[in-house]
């Protein structure tokens, strides 16, 4: 167990031109707050996927009113750290999302309004117990500077917070085979209490005799890497050789969701859908009011003036969930016809149509040949959203306006001479060669390399190429 700590240092205009306008004004004073969402491993940073490692909301910053005419400075920040406790081992690699929210303090009906100013995301490697890591992230014209670290809660120590420490029994040194616990040099590593043989790198335990696996490892001793490719059953065959997840209790067995939350399995773990008034990985956090700003992505919070009455988040278009935390994937309904590309812009859906199709949903098939004339007797052929001309002999180009020079490509081999002909080209072959393009040598005895020359044509005669 341990705590991930995040310190925001500054949020303001980034370097370079195009400084953003101040988010607050004399008419609409506002204050900032931050939300951090953590996910284990180098998982997708999609804002709507659950914060499986945990999430935290900062306090509100000081009220800020823009000075007219002044550029947006670094905005005043909330005091203190954002702390995300983690119960199990620290995964070492994690993804984060940090959102900067603005709370407008004007005369809004129904209380303050929240809007998302900036969202930054990243994937990082971080060992617990190390120094503060510093980071700069840019979101549009805004720049966010922050530090973060993961620290273990005693008695846990180590880069994954999986080793345990106990006070020394003897004043001078630790027992046989046990090291002092840095940074608690006056303590000693606790004797191993995990199941015998439990992998020290990939397994850990919280109770004597157990062996729980870090993400990506399985087996009774956490020595088998998880392979997701060769598993046949929903949780994989029970086989130590394939390295698949062993069938057995699913992540939702025993319902880990508290306070009436409902559990659903995800590819990696589980997700709790919490009843109103509760949130957190396992719906364990309660007593939320609208003052805590529980509605994300611009959702409007109504009710919930005191911890005993539930609040309701009214979500803006494109978001759902009890806290508006889930983005609606409106493109999954495949609204774009005829192979059009769906773009969810948040405020609206757009279809980018393939050539030859139009309309809000690419439902109109354009007549490619309408109004397209092919010159010199060419005929228009429709296809693939673009018109094409099939040209009469002797003509070429997109609209058959160019007179084709059949000899331009030097089609006659072995020094044959090319003559343009109304129906194509004719090759006059050099002595010793024959064929439509003079490609065949004539054998010294008069026989050709082909079967016989066509009747009526002697070797060496000009060959007409149709």
């Amino acid at each position: 167990a341990g705590v991930f700590e995040l310190q925001i240092h500054s949020f303001g205009p980034g370097p370079g031109p195009g400084a953003p306008r101040s988010p607050c004004s004399a008419r609409l004073p506002c204050r900032l707050f931050f939300r951090v969402c953590l996910k284990p491993g180098l998982s997708e940073e999609a804002a709507e996927s659950p914060c499986a490692l945990g999430a935290a909301l900062s306090a509100r910053g000081p009220v800020y009113t823009e000075q007219p005419g002044a550029p947006a400075p670094d905005l005043p920040l909330p005091d203190g750290l954002l702390q995300v406790p983690f119960r199990d081992a620290w995964p070492g690699t994690f993804s984060f999302i940090i959102e900067t929210w603005r709370e407008e303090l004007g005369d809004q009906i129904g209380g303050p309004a929240w809007s998302l100013l900036a969202r930054v995301a990243g994937r990082r490697r971080l060992a617990a117990g190390g120094p503060w890591a510093r980071d700069i992230q840019r979101a549009g014209a805004w720049e966010l500077r922050f530090s973060y670290r993961a620290r273990c809660e005693p008695p846990a120590v180590g880069t994954a917070c999986t080793r345990l420490c106990r006070p020394r029994s003897a004043p001078s040194r630790c027992g046989p085979g046990l090291r002092p616990c840095a940074p608690l040099e006056d303590e000693c590593e606790a004797p191993l209490v995990c199941r015998a043989g439990c992998s020290p790198e990939h397994g850990f335990c919280e109770q004597p005799g157990e062996c729980r696996c870090l993400e990506g490892w399985t087996g009774p001793l956490c020595t088998v890497p998880v392979s997701t490719s060769s598993c046949l059953s929903p949780r994989g065959p029970s086989s130590a050789t394939t390295g698949c997840l062993v069938p057995g209790p699913g992540p939702c067995d025993g319902n880990p969701c508290a306070n009436g939350g409902s559990c659903s399995e995800t590819p990696r773990s589980f997700e709790c859908t919490c009843p109103r008034g509760f949130y957190g990985l396992r719906c364990e956090v309660s007593g939320v009011t609208c003052a805590d700003g529980p509605c994300f992505n611009g959702g409007l919070c109504v009710g919930g003036a005191d911890p005993d009455s539930a609040y309701i988040c009214h979500c803006p278009p494109g978001f759902q969930g009890s806290n508006c935390e889930k983005r609606v994937d409106r493109c999954s309904l495949q609204p774009c016809r005829n192979g059009g590309l769906c773009l969810d812009l948040g405020h609206a859906l757009r279809c980018r149509c393939r050539a030859g199709f139009a309309g809000p949903r690419c439902e109109h098939d354009l007549d490619d040949c309408a109004g397209r004339a092919c010159a010199n007797g060419g005929t228009c052929v429709e296809g693939g959203g673009a018109h094409r001309c099939s040209c009469a002999l002797g003509f070429g180009g997109r609209d058959c306006r160019e007179r084709a020079d059949p000899c331009a490509a030097r089609p006659c081999a072995h020094g044959g001479r090319c003559y343009a002909h109304f129906s194509g080209l004719v090759c006059a072959c050099a002595p010793g060669y024959m064929g439509a393009r003079c490609e065949f040598p004539v054998h010294p005895d008069g026989a050709s390399a082909l079967p016989a020359a066509p009747p009526g044509l002697r070797p060496g005669d000009p060959q007409r190429y149709l």
Epitope: Q7, A127, G130, W132, R134, S147, T159
Partner: antibody, heavy 122, light 107 residues
Framework: QVQLVQSGAEVKRPGASVKVSCKAS????????MHWVRQAPGQGLEWMGW????????NYAQKFQGRVTMTRDTSISTAYMEVNRLRSDDTAVYYC???????????????WAQGTTVTVSS | DIQMTQSPSSLSASVGDRVTITCQAS??????LNWYQQKPGKAPKLLIY???NLETGVPSRFSGSGSGTDFTFTISTLQPEDIATYYC?????????FGGGTKVEIR
């Protein structure tokens, strides 16, 4: 007390490599970044990069990328800095220095070792 | 990279004098500035961080000020043991860069 002690002076030929060590004591080695800074004779200070002893992550100044390697051995609380393909202009005093690990936006050096003189000469 | 320009490069002053050194950054570095003292043949020593905060154990005659691009380091009453070269160093971003140094001598 908090202390950093570096290895002794080195004389090297151009094209050779040198590896300087920096032993930490009096504090938790893995809890603080270690910077490396050099100073050519009669010149100013030049930052070379840092290493996070906890994870082994490094960040090098562009000028030294590909030619400098920073490593550590946590079991003996020692950081190392190796410079390859030495040139005469690498002649300098090389310092390791601890970053104070402030929570604020900060990079600096609050504890310095005595320095290691590296002379590159044919 | 951010350039740090220190001036003067050297100065001579009498014991008891007020000494001022300036450091200019090539771009806005907020208050992300350190000042170090290096005595001949020794390693540098951190005196001031965050442009104006005195490091623990450093005498109060040393002070720093400034923000953005222009910074000042002051020794209010020069002492004989202050003979050294003084460097500024920014930490707005990586790479960290130092000023060229100011050598302070006793007249």
């Amino acid at each position: 007390q908090v202390q950093l002690v570096q290895s002794g002076a080195e004389v090297k030929r151009p094209g050779a490599s040198v590896k300087v060590s920096c032993k930490a004591s009096g504090y938790t080695f893995t809890g603080y970044y270690m910077h490396w800074v050099r100073q050519a004779p009669g010149q100013g200070l030049e930052w070379m990069g840092w290493i996070d002893p906890n994870s082994g992550d490094t960040n090098y100044a562009q000028k030294f990328q590909g030619r400098v390697t920073m490593t550590r051995d946590t079991s003996i609380s020692t950081a190392y800095m190796e410079v390859n393909r030495l040139r005469s202009d690498d002649t300098a005093v090389y310092y390791c220095a601890r970053d104070p690990n402030r929570r604020s936006w900060y990079y600096g050096m609050d504890v310095w070792a005595q320095g290691t003189t590296v002379t590159v000469s044919s | 990279d951010i350039q740090m320009t220190q001036s003067p490069s050297s100065l001579s002053a009498s014991v008891g004098d007020r000494v001022t050194i300036t450091c200019q950054a090539s771009q806005d570095i907020r208050n992300y500035l350190n000042w170090y003292q290096q005595k001949p043949g020794k390693a540098p020593k951190l005196l001031i961080y965050d442009a104006s905060n005195l490091e623990t154990g450093v005498p109060s005659r040393f002070s720093g000020s400034g923000s953005g691009t222009d910074f000042t380091f002051t020794i209010s009453t020069l002492q004989p043991e202050d003979i050294a070269t003084y460097y500024c160093q920014h930490y707005d971003n990586l790479p960290l860069t130092f000023g060229g140094g100011t050598k302070v001598e006793i007249r």
